[in-house]
């Protein structure tokens, strides 16, 4: 049994770090493997994560880490019974992937303006709460070329656009993701998409 693709880990900067890796063949991750993790330098208990399968040869482990500072670094040991398959380290503050925003809603009743709102995925007492910026993706279900990204660089989880910037009479979908510049994070996953029918009053043409 060998590791084909070494574990890579990301932290949600809240309570969970997720590590993924691939084995060299089909593996029952939960029965055959264990991922041990422990803080470097600080005296603390070693913790064990039981991985789950993620495709035939893929494994994923959700490491519980609920008290983390910038200086913290973890050793990671991947074991198959008594055999050490891989040893590495992981610094949560340097590998942050924010949680995905939720509750994306499109308000279409605001005088030819579309108001998109969503929820910040972090509670107000989390450091990332006031540091997230967003990207909103809007696309047409009918026309694959009608695909646009709006960067929301202010803190408020909302976006206003004129309905007239989109085509009238057709259906659109939107989704949103987040990142935090302060930790040079990766982008979060996209939120679930929401659908609406875009319609607005065309202005009268002047002749």
């Amino acid at each position: 049994m060998k590791v084909l693709q070494e574990p890579t880990c990301v932290s949600d900067y809240m309570s969970i770090s997720t590590c993924e890796w691939k084995m060299n063949g089909p593996t029952n991750c939960s029965t055959e493997l264990r991922l041990l993790y422990q803080l470097v330098f600080l005296l603390s208990e070693a913790h064990t994560c039981i991985p789950e399968n993620n495709g035939g040869a893929g494994c994923v482990c959700h490491l519980l880490m609920d008290d983390v500072v910038s200086a913290d670094n973890y050793t990671l040991d991947l074991w198959a019974g008594q055999q050490l398959l891989w040893k590495g380290s992981f610094k949560p503050s340097e590998h942050v992937k924010p949680r995905a925003p939720g509750n994306l809603t499109v308000h279409t009743n605001v005088s030819d303006t579309l108001l998109l709102t969503w929820s910040n995925p972090y509670p107000p007492d989390n450091y990332l709460y006031n540091h997230l910026t967003y990207a909103v993706n809007i696309w047409s279900e009918n026309d694959p070329a009608d695909f646009r990204i709006y960067n929301v660089t202010y803190l408020e989880p909302s976006l206003r656009i004129a309905a007239s910037t989109l085509k009238s009479g057709i259906s659109y979908r939107a989704r949103v993701r987040a990142w935090a510049q302060c930790y040079n994070t990766t982008w979060s996953e996209w939120s679930p998409s929401t659908k609406w029918h875009n319609s607005y009053r065309e202005p009268f043409e002047q002749h």
């Epitope: 809240m14 005296l43 008290d67 500072v69 910038s70 200086a71 503050s93 989390n126 450091y127 302060c182």
Partner: antibody, heavy 124, light 107 residues
Framework: EVQLVESGGGLVQPGRSLRLSCAAS????????MHWVRQAPGKGLEWVSG????????GYADSVKGRFTISRDNAKNSLYLQMNSLRAEDTALYYC?????????????????WGQGTLVTVSS | EIVMTQSPATLSVSPGERATLSCRAS??????LAWYQHKPGQAPRLLIY???TRATGIPARFSGSGSGTEFTLTISSLQSEDFAVYYC?????????FGGGTKVEIK
């Protein structure tokens, strides 16, 4: 108002022990990590030890590892430093410091509140 | 461990002038740097964290900049109460380490 008051310092002979205490008030003590930082006469600041809110993780500078033990009593809002096998180079003003941020994920550790310090002199 | 080096050791400045203090890390600490002010007989006071974020109640004349290995604390117009020793501290790695300090004295 956040207050940190250290006590327990004094003159002690090399090889002997001393226990420092820090009484905390003005904040929810059991939400925060706490630390000890010292300053030798005429020198700069040196981090000595730190302890997480639940005592689940503890750290020591190499210079005191194996000799000093940090602990806390959240019910009493108190932080302690048990210093054994003291040496002349442990002579310093010892500060109790509250970690900035809160329990959970946070930047740090840096220290947003400090006590006035308690002086430890190790001499024969 | 990460070694923090501050310069100059002493800075002589007249009240109202600008003071620029430097702090260098032996390896990158990203933005994980704090600055403290320390006066004799008093508790140290947090000025800056995250390399550039002013702590609560700190006047706007104090500003921090830099990332990686080079950091600067600037006091735009020195007031009489600003004469003190200033320390930088990295919190990118355990053990936490401080610079040797810069004493800002009256010229």
């Amino acid at each position: 108002e956040v207050q940190l008051v250290e006590s327990g310092g004094g003159l002690v002979q090399p090889g002997r022990s001393l226990r420092l205490s820090c009484a905390a008030s003005g904040f929810t003590f059991d939400n925060y990590a706490m630390h000890w930082v010292r300053q030798a006469p005429g020198k700069g600041l040196e981090w000595v030890s730190g302890i997480r809110w639940n005592s689940g993780s503890i750290g020591y500078a190499d210079s005191v590892k194996g000799r000093f033990t940090i602990s806390r009593d959240n019910a009493k809002n108190s932080l302690y430093l048990q210093m054994n096998s003291l040496r002349a180079e442990d002579t310093a003003l010892y500060y109790c410091a509250k970690e900035g941020g809160y329990s959970g994920y946070r930047p740090g550790p840096f220290f947003d509140y400090w006590g006035q310090g308690t002086l430890v002199t190790v001499s024969s | 461990e990460i070694v923090m080096t501050q310069s100059p050791a002493t800075l002589s400045v007249s009240p109202g002038e600008r003071a620029t203090l430097s702090c260098r890390a032996s390896q990158s600490v990203n933005y994980n740097l704090a600055w403290y002010q320390h006066k004799p007989g008093q508790a140290p006071r947090l000025l800056i964290y995250g390399a550039s974020t002013r702590a609560t109640g700190i006047p706007a004349r104090f500003s921090g900049s830099g990332s990686g290995t080079e950091f600067t604390l600037t006091i735009s117009s020195l007031q009489s109460e600003d004469f003190a020793v200033y320390y930088c501290q990295q919190y990118n790695n355990w053990p936490l380490t401080f610079g040797g300090g810069t004493k800002v004295e009256i010229k």
